[in-house]
Structure formats: structure tokens, C-alpha cells
């Protein structure tokens, strides 16, 4: 059982109130985290509540404002970035969102030495990406799909690329599919550690089919949004990696980095770039059939002025049971010798663990092991390696931070976080200063989140950075639901679940059950984190039991569970939700005539298939922005798990796994289908096709579209969405309004 904030005695119970939908929509019970913006081993910047940019020195205990809120306000800045030489700050304003990570903005450069904005050779607008060099104050930026370089903020720019074209050629920024499914960043350029070189990717989308949808806006005629978007099996972007010497870029020009021969022989992806030193770079490549990844270490040859990637420095990672990596192929963390590295990949037992690679992957030394998984390597110093895992007490949905001493032999392991605030904190991330002199721990739950500062040598807590006191006080008179995280053992499969129970839960009574599902490959829903959200309200106020179940295909419990769904999406994820529901019914407190399922995105796909499973278990369900056929979704994501939609590959399962193929089975359930018309990610096409199939089958259903809304259904649409879904569920469960 997970303990939430302590309950007051019965005498005070009449002052307690249930959560309301309004609480959720207003974000009344949202929490804060504190991530220091590290600028050295012992200093960090933080934006204060009144919007001053303050520099803190941990060792002297001093703090001072480096940029006043007045300066920030003068250009309506919402973000900032200090140059490493501390002479300049860029101020970001006019934020305009594009896709998940990408946005454009206007940038102003403020000179801290004279307290004035840099005049002359101002930056163009809007800029797609801008960053300082890691040393000094060089600037690289992307404008209209081309990369520019400034040696100093007041200098004129050197244009590095010239072929950038909207929706055709992208330099230094990813196209849609690379942004969403491969890099998970808004940028595709990387400075070398001392700023000597700048590496960048060029994506050529010339031959990619375009998704077009209407954006209605307010004009007489809607405009059409066109995005080069490769769906499963379609032509993919062509990627090339270049490196330019930023000291004298006009002389040698960009140098193209060679692709490993075994990768270049067929369609491939570039997956990440990691600088090791100024003259050594590591590139990761992936075959289009994503079970082979190659890590290539390239060296700058001064005498040739070229980047050499010898075959002896190519490391192959291959999966025989699924795809390479977890969600993404992991990235290496290099050690101080600048050639060996630490990397997470599957061990012989099928668990993702940290390995140390000195010469070849075959000779890798396993650093962690066990029937649990290493999740992230945060930092490697000369004597320590910091990582997170879900080892502690065998709960896959927890995250603790560990330190392995690599300076001593044999290496010793210490859990840094396991016993700090054991009841409150079981899910951590961390942020390290230079050389890991200090670090911040951010605890996400299950109790109220708290952020703390620690000494990197002793692990001692130095101070609390954010403890969410106001939230704690605000929750004192709220009847929060109870939460429990447990597991079901079914046919040699462990199904972890989280159950959210009404505050006055009584096992002898019957409650309506709502399953919330995501279920996508390498996802995890059952996590020991704090949240006051819509489902908290449904339990607290409406008396529902809500359950989240991690079935086959989900992450951090070994490859057997993860890769079970390989090449057959839509089968086991659904089966496992159904199995769990049957087990919940057996527990005796579920009203089996009032069971619903809902999900968003991949969860919308799973909930739709579950409703159409013909089991009769579900009375109703909701699909928000669901995938309906894997032929409609992005190549990079879909083919990772499904292969290609071709006759000689996996076309049959592509066809068998559609929602439309089960239209007939929706006849005996109440189905609410919801989608944004401007969804760039899971296209409205998906829901349009479900609706068409249901109409053709003469099956009644409910639907709601959100005009001009994307996959996130944000702003006022959020309020409308949750209000609408609440009404639907209450009607389904015969709950009075």
C-alpha cells in the first residue's frame, strides 16, 4: 500500500472534501520541481519566483542576480541562456510551438559587461534553434532550415548551409519523424566539448509523402498544413552528418562523416551523436529494420583534415528477439580515457544492464546484473558511476539512484536514495554539476514531490530546494484516494497494476471499475509517482475504482515481457488488460456490470481493441486520438515493432490488427471516439476510418472532434474533453450528476 499524506481524525472528517473536476482542470494541486541550471562544479542559475535570474554558489553560500526581471520584461523573455564565458545572455521571447519539442522564438543578446543589448548584426527572426558553444561565446543557430555561426554575438554570421528549404531540406534541426521518433529533441547539431567543431545533421525529405490536413482558423478558407511524414513502409528521410571547423569554417568547409558500410548497404537511420573529445566523435546508426545498431567512433586526422571512422572502432548491437534497445537505442557514456564507454543493453538473461566496453562489445564487462533493469546512466567521473534502476525491493515502477565506485576493485555499489525518505520518495531522477561535485535529487513520489541538493562526494543532503509546502497544506483537507501497487501472476507473466481506490473504500461493497491504459511498447504506467489528476477525482468524488496495468510489451521488467509484442502489436497488450480485469472481478469489490476502459494515443488503440474483443467485460469505453491501423502511423516507430507492411514481411498482421476490422464487435458497447482535427502525430485519418467502418457496419457510437487541436488537446479543449468524458462515464455507470 502506498501511503498518501496522513489523514486527520474522524472528529475532523466533516472538514474534509472530495476532489472536484474543477480542482483538476484548474491545476489546483499541481507540484513544483527544482532542476538547477548548472554552470560549473559548484554554481547554478535559477529563475526566482519574481523572474530574476539568480546565480547561486553552493560553496560560498552566496547568491546574486545576474539578470533582473526588468531586463527580462523589456523583451518579454520567457527563457534565457548564459554563455559559458559569462559575458552574454540570450533572452528568448515570442515562443511559438511547432511539434512536440520544436518551437521558434525571437532571441536577443544581452551583454553583461556593459548592461546593454548587443546592437548591430542582430539575429534574424524567428529562429528555429540557437545555442552557445560549450566554451566562450560563439553562437550557432538555425534560421529557415539553414545553420549560421557567429564567432561573437556582435559579429556578422557565417552561413554554414545554403540548401535548407521548408519541408524539403532540414539542416541542424530534425524533420517531423526524426524529432518525434528518433532524436526526441528540437535540434540536430552538436558542439564539440571545447567548441572547435560543430557537427550537424542534414535531413532530406524531398521524396517523403506528405500528410495534409485542414487548419480551420478564422479565415473564410481553411489553410492546409503539409508535413513530410513517412508512414509505415513509405520513403524515409535521407540523413547525412557533417562536421565543420568553427575556427576557420570558410576554409575546409563541412566534412561529411562516413556511414558504416554494413549500415549504408540498405535504408538506415542516424540515431545519435556523442562528442568524446574535440577530435573524437561517436555516431550511432540503425538499420531501417531496427534490430541492428552500429556505434561508430571517428577521429579527426589533422594531417588529412578529415574524420576517420575505422572498422575497428565500429561496435554492433543486435537483437535476435526483438528490436535494438528499449524505446531508443541507448547512448554511450565515455570514460576518462576517451575510448572506453559504459552503455545499457540486454545481458544474456534478457535484462537491460550497464556494460563497460573497452575494445569490443563481445568482450564487454557487465557492471550491473539481476532480474531488474538499469535505466539511465547519469554521470561517470574518474571514480564513480551514477545510475538509476528499479532494483530496490523488486518494484519495477520505482527509480532509485545508485553510485558504483569504479575507481576501486572490485567496484562497490551504494544506493544513494533508497532510504532517504522511504515512504515519500521511491521515484527519483538526478541532475549533476560538473565533475559531479554536487547533484540535485528530484523525487516524484509516491508522496508529495521534493527536490534536494547533495554533496557529490559524501552524498550528504545540503538543503531542500523545493518541498511543495503550499501543496501539502492545500491537500490537508482533501479526501485523496488510496493507491496500491501490486502484482498478478498469470501463466508465468507478472502483471503489475496500480489501483486507485475511493477514500472510504470498503472491500465488501461493489464499485464501478475504470481501466486506464496506455500499453505501448517500452512504456510503463505503473509507477510510484505522485499525481492528483482526473482519475484521482473519479475515485475521490465519483467513487470509481481505477486500475492501470502493465502487460506484455511494457518496459523495465526484462526482454521476455518487452519483446513479447514484437511483430504483433494489438494482441497481447489487449489480452493482458482483459486478464487483469477478470482478476479484479475475482477480488470481489468490482461491479462487473460497470466496467469501462479508456486510453489516449496508443492507449486509445488498446482501449478500442479491448472494447471490440467480444468478451462482454466492458460496458463502455473511450478512445482519445487512437491509432486505428499501423499503416497510418510513422515509419520509425511502427516498423521498430511491426516490421514492414509488405507481403514478404508483416502485411498480414498490419491488416489483422486494425480497429476497423472489428467494427462489428462495437455493437454491444458504448464507445466514445475523440480526436483533434489538427493532430500532426496520430492523424485524424485514424478516427475518420474507425467512424467510417462503424457507420458502414451500422454500429451506433458517440464521437467528439476538437477543431484545430493537435495530439495533446490542450487549452480550453482539455477542460471540454475531461468534462465530456466525465459525463460519458457517469452515464455509463449510472452515477447521478
Amino acid at each position: 500500500i502506498v501511503l498518501r499524506p496522513s489523514r486527520v481524525h474522524n472528529s475532523e472528517e466533516n472538514t474534509m472534501r472530495a476532489l472536484t473536476l474543477k480542482d483538476i482542470l484548474n491545476g489546483t494541486f499541481s507540484y513544483k520541481t527544482f532542476f538547477p541550471n548548472w554552470i560549473s562544479g559548484q554554481e547554478y542559475l535559477h529563475q526566482s519566483a519574481d523572474n530574476n535570474i539568480v546565480l547561486y554558489n553552493i560553496e560560498t553560500g552566496q547568491s546574486y542576480t545576474i539578470l533582473s526581471n526588468r531586463t527580462m520584461k523589456s523583451v518579454n523573455a520567457s527563457n534565457y541562456g548564459l554563455s559559458p564565458d559569462r559575458q552574454f545572455v540570450y533572452l528568448e521571447s515570442d515562443y511559438s510551438k511547432l511539434w512536440r519539442y520544436s518551437y521558434t522564438a525571437t532571441y536577443y543578446i544581452y551583454d553583461l559587461s556593459n548592461g546593454e543589448f548587443v546592437r548591430g548584426n542582430e539575429l534574424p527572426r524567428p529562429i528555429q534553434y540557437l545555442c552557445w558553444s560549450p566554451v566562450g561565446s560563439k553562437l550557432a543557430y538555425v534560421y529557415q532550415n539553414n545553420i549560421y555561426l557567429k564567432q561573437r554575438p556582435g559579429d556578422p554570421p557565417f552561413q554554414i548551409t545554403f540548401n535548407g528549404r521548408e519541408n524539403k531540406i532540414f539542416n541542424g534541426i530534425p524533420d517531423w519523424v526524426y524529432e518525434e521518433e528518433m532524436l526526441a529533441t528540437k535540434y540536430a547539431l552538436w558542439w564539440s566539448p571545447n567548441g572547435k567543431f560543430l557537427a550537424y545533421a542534414e535531413f532530406n525529405d524531398t521524396d517523403i509523402p506528405v500528410i495534409a490536413y485542414s487548419y480551420y482558423g478564422d479565415e473564410q478558407y481553411p489553410r492546409t498544413i503539409n508535413i513530410p511524414y513517412p508512414k509505415a513502409g513509405a520513403k524515409n528521410p535521407v540523413v547525412r552528418i557533417f562536421i565543420i571547423d568553427t575556427t576557420y569554417p570558410a576554409y575546409v568547409g563541412p566534412q561529411e562523416v562516413p556511414v558504416p558500410a554494413m549500415i549504408a548497404s540498405s535504408d538506415y537511420y542516424f540515431s545519435w551523436l556523442t562528442w568524446v573529445t574535440d577530435e573524437r566523435v561517436c555516431l550511432q546508426w540503425l538499420k531501417r529494420v531496427q534490430n541492428v545498431s552500429v556505434l561508430s567512433i571517428c577521429d579527426f586526422r589533422e594531417d588529412w583534415q578529415t574524420w576517420d571512422c575505422p572498422k575497428t572502432q565500429e561496435h554492433i548491437e543486435e537483437s535476435r528477439t526483438g528490436w535494438a534497445g528499449g524505446f531508443f537505442v541507448s547512448t554511450p557514456v565515455f570514460s576518462y580515457d576517451a575510448i572506453s564507454y559504459y552503455k545499457i543493453f540486454s545481458d544474456k538473461d534478457g535484462y537491460k544492464h550497464i556494460h563497460y566496453i573497452k575494445d569490443t562489445v563481445e568482450n564487454a564487462i557487465q557492471i550491473t546484473s539481476g532480474k531488474w533493469e538499469a535505466i539511465n546512466i547519469f554521470r561517470v567521473t574518474q571514480d564513480s558511476l551514477f545510475y538509476s534502476s528499479n532494483e530496490f525491493e523488486e518494484y519495477p515502477g520505482r527509480r532509485n539512484i545508485y553510485r558504483i565506485s569504479i575507481g576501486s576493485y572490485p567496484p562497490s555499489k551504494k544506493c544513494v536514495t533508497c532510504h532517504l525518505r522511504k515512504e515519500r520518495c521511491q521515484y527519483y531522477t538526478a541532475s549533476f554539476s560538473d565533475y559531479a561535485k554536487y547533484y540535485a535529487l528530484v523525487c516524484y513520489g509516491p508522496g508529495i514531490p521534493i527536490s534536494t541538493l547533495h554533496d557529490g562526494r559524501t552524498d550528504q543532503e545540503i538543503k531542500i530546494l523545493e518541498e511543495n509546502k503550499e501543496l501539502e497544506n492545500a491537500l490537508k483537507n482533501i479526501q485523496l484516494p488510496k493507491e496500491e501497487i501490486k502484482k498478478l501472476e498469470v501463466d508465468e507473466i507478472t502483471l503489475w497494476y496500480k489501483m486507485i481506490l475511493p477514500p472510504q473504500f470498503d472491500r465488501s461493497k461493489k464499485y464501478p471499475l475504470l481501466i486506464q491504459v496506455y500499453g505501448g511498447p517500452c512504456s510503463q504506467s505503473v509507477r510510484s509517482v505522485f499525481a492528483v489528476n482526473w482519475i484521482s477525482y473519479l475515485a475521490s468524488k465519483e467513487g470509481m475504482v481505477i486500475a492501470l496495468v502493465d502487460g506484455r510489451g511494457t518496459a523495465f521488467q526484462g526482454d521476455k515481457l518487452l519483446y513479447a509484442v514484437y511483430r504483433k502489436l494489438g494482441v497481447y497488450e489487449v489480452e493482458d488488460q482483459i486478464t487483469a480485469v477478470r482478476k479484479f472481478i475475482e477480488m470481489g469489490f468490482i461491479d462487473e456490470k460497470r466496467i469501462a476502459i479508456w486510453g489516449w494515443s496508443y492507449g486509445g488503440y488498446v482501449s478500442s481493441l479491448a472494447l471490440a474483443s467480444g468478451t462482454g467485460l466492458f460496458k463502455c469505453g473511450i478512445a482519445v486520438a487512437p491509432v486505428s491501423s499501423w499503416e497510418y502511423y510513422a515509419s520509425v516507430y511502427t516498423e521498430r515493432f511491426m516490421g514492414l507492411p509488405t507481403k514478404d514481411d508483416n502485411l498480414e498482421h498490419y491488416k489483422n490488427s486494425t480497429v476497423m476490422a472489428r467494427a462489428e464487435y462495437f455493437r454491444n458497447v458504448d464507445y466514445l471516439l475523440i480526436h483533434g482535427t489538427a493532430d500532426d502525430n496520430v492523424h485524424f485519418q485514424n478516427s475518420a476510418q474507425i467512424a467510417k467502418a462503424l457507420v458502414n457496419a451500422q454500429v451506433d457510437f458517440q464521437a467528439m472532434w476538437y477543431s484545430d487541436q493537435n495530439h495533446g488537446l490542450s487549452g480550453l479543449s482539455t477542460n471540454h474533453l475531461y468534462t465530456h468524458m466525465t459525463h460519458f462515464l457517469k452515464q455509463c455507470f449510472s452515477l447521478s450528476d
Epitope: Q159, N163, P249, A250, Y251, G253, E256, Q305
Partner: antibody
Framework: EVQLLESGGGLVQPGGSLRLSCAAS????????MSWVRQAPGKGLEWVSG????????YYADSVKGRFTISRDNSKNTLYLQMNSLRAEDTAVYYC??????????WGQGTLVTVSS | EIVLTQSPGTLSLSPGERATLSCRAS???????LAWYQQKPGQAPRLLIN???RRATGIPDRFSGSGSGTDFTLTISRLEPEDFAVYYC?????????FGQGTKVEIK
């Protein structure tokens, strides 16, 4: 010792074509960007075109865009300039030079292209 | 495109004298992207000052480049007989790379 040796120049009628070659030696040819620069009789220098080491990026002066094509064969250590639809104003000594946008540190001896009827 | 204007068009000096050649850009260039070349009749140009005001390999130290923004100078501290030639400045910050029209340094 770095050497660049142009060839292929000569007399050609307006509208005609020529292909210039530049044989390189004394350095790792495939690593370096190369350019063509021309000089009309008694006039100054004009950059014509540039190509990076791998051949993957090329640029042209507006005056020759669409008519001239720069290319390279790294296995033969040779740079080329294919010139089509030649005009009288293309008459010049054509130099191949080692470099991208600037700092052309090695030049060939040049080859004369005369466009005349 | 960036226009580079060199002055004077011709400079008449005696051996041993100091020569100061000017190059003005139509927009800001910075020394990181400005080079100087020497060309003698019937010969190919020869790089003197590389981008970043660095002397090219084998160039005597009597040649030096300076300047920033839009105004640049090539200085020959003591003219030697072999220095009489045409000198060109060239910018490489913006496509297309452009050359000045040249300054002829002749024997007085």
C-alpha cells in the same frame, strides 16, 4: 608538395560546352573542399563554384548557375568543371584552388577558356 | 553579395618603403573571414594572409593583415623588389565568396 594541374581549356563557340579537369597531388584530395576561380583577361578574380571533400555539397556563382556543374572523382584525385551553354563573358583563365569559401592556399597554373564565334 | 572595394587602385612606392593597402566591405565581415592574395603577371594568385589574419605558410613576416568589421588593411612593412604585384582581398563569410578589384603596387 601540393600540385594542382588544370587542363581542358580551349576555344569554343558560344552555346558550346567544355569540360575542365584539375589533377591534384601532394595532399589527401578527398578531405578538402575545392573551388574554381576565374579571371577574365585584364580583370579581377571571380569565384565560380565550390565542392566539399565528399562531393556531397556544391555551390555556384549566380552567373554560372544552371550552366556549369562542379564534380570530383576522389579515386582519381581529380576535380571537374562541366561548362555548358558557354557565353562570350565566360572567357577567362580558370583556376582550380584548394579551399571552400576562402583561404585558397593552393592554386593551379590556370587554363584559358575562350568563347568566340 | 558583399562588395569589396580596394584602395588605392594603384600604389607607387620605392623598395624599402611601407605599403598600406585598404579593403572596405559593403557589410560587416570580420577578420575571421577575410584573406589577402598576391598575383604577379602570368601567374596564379598566391595566398598571403589567411582567414583570421594568419600569415599563410612560407609568407615573410613583413606582410601583416589587420582590421575588423568593414575596414581591413594589408601592410607590407618594407617593400622588397619581389613584392611589386597586384593584391586582392577576399571575403568568405557569405556566398558567393567575392574578391576586391585589386590594388596594383608598382615601383615608383
Amino acid at each position: 608538395e601540393v600540385q594542382l594541374l588544370e587542363s581542358g581549356g580551349g576555344l569554343v563557340q558560344p552555346g558550346g560546352s567544355l569540360r575542365l579537369s584539375c589533377a591534384a597531388s601532394g595532399f589527401t584530395f578527398s578531405s578538402y573542399a575545392m573551388s574554381w576561380v576565374r579571371q577574365a583577361p585584364g580583370k579581377g578574380l571571380e569565384w565560380v563554384s565550390g565542392i566539399i571533400g565528399s562531393g556531397g555539397i556544391t555551390y555556384y556563382a549566380d552567373s554560372v548557375k544552371g550552366r556549369f556543374t562542379i564534380s570530383r572523382d576522389n579515386s582519381k584525385n581529380t576535380l571537374y568543371l562541366q561548362m555548358n551553354s558557354l557565353r562570350a563573358e565566360d572567357t577567362a583563365v580558370y583556376y582550380c584552388a584548394k579551399g571552400w569559401f576562402g583561404g585558397f592556399n593552393y592554386w593551379g597554373q590556370g587554363t584559358l577558356v575562350t568563347v568566340s564565334s | 553579395e558583399i562588395v569589396l572595394t580596394q584602395s588605392p587602385g594603384t600604389l607607387s612606392l620605392s623598395p624599402g618603403e611601407r605599403a598600406t593597402l585598404s579593403c572596405r566591405a559593403s557589410q560587416s565581415v570580420t577578420s575571421s573571414y577575410l584573406a589577402w592574395y598576391q598575383q604577379k603577371p602570368g601567374q596564379a594568385p598566391r595566398l598571403l594572409i589567411n582567414v583570421g589574419s594568419r600569415r599563410a605558410t612560407g609568407i615573410p613576416d613583413r606582410f601583416s593583415g589587420s582590421g575588423s568589421g568593414t575596414d581591413f588593411t594589408l601592410t607590407i612593412s618594407r617593400l622588397e623588389p619581389e613584392d611589386f604585384a597586384v593584391y586582392y582581398c577576399q571575403q568568405g563569410i557569405m556566398l558567393p565568396p567575392t574578391f576586391g578589384q585589386g590594388t596594383k603596387v608598382e615601383i615608383k
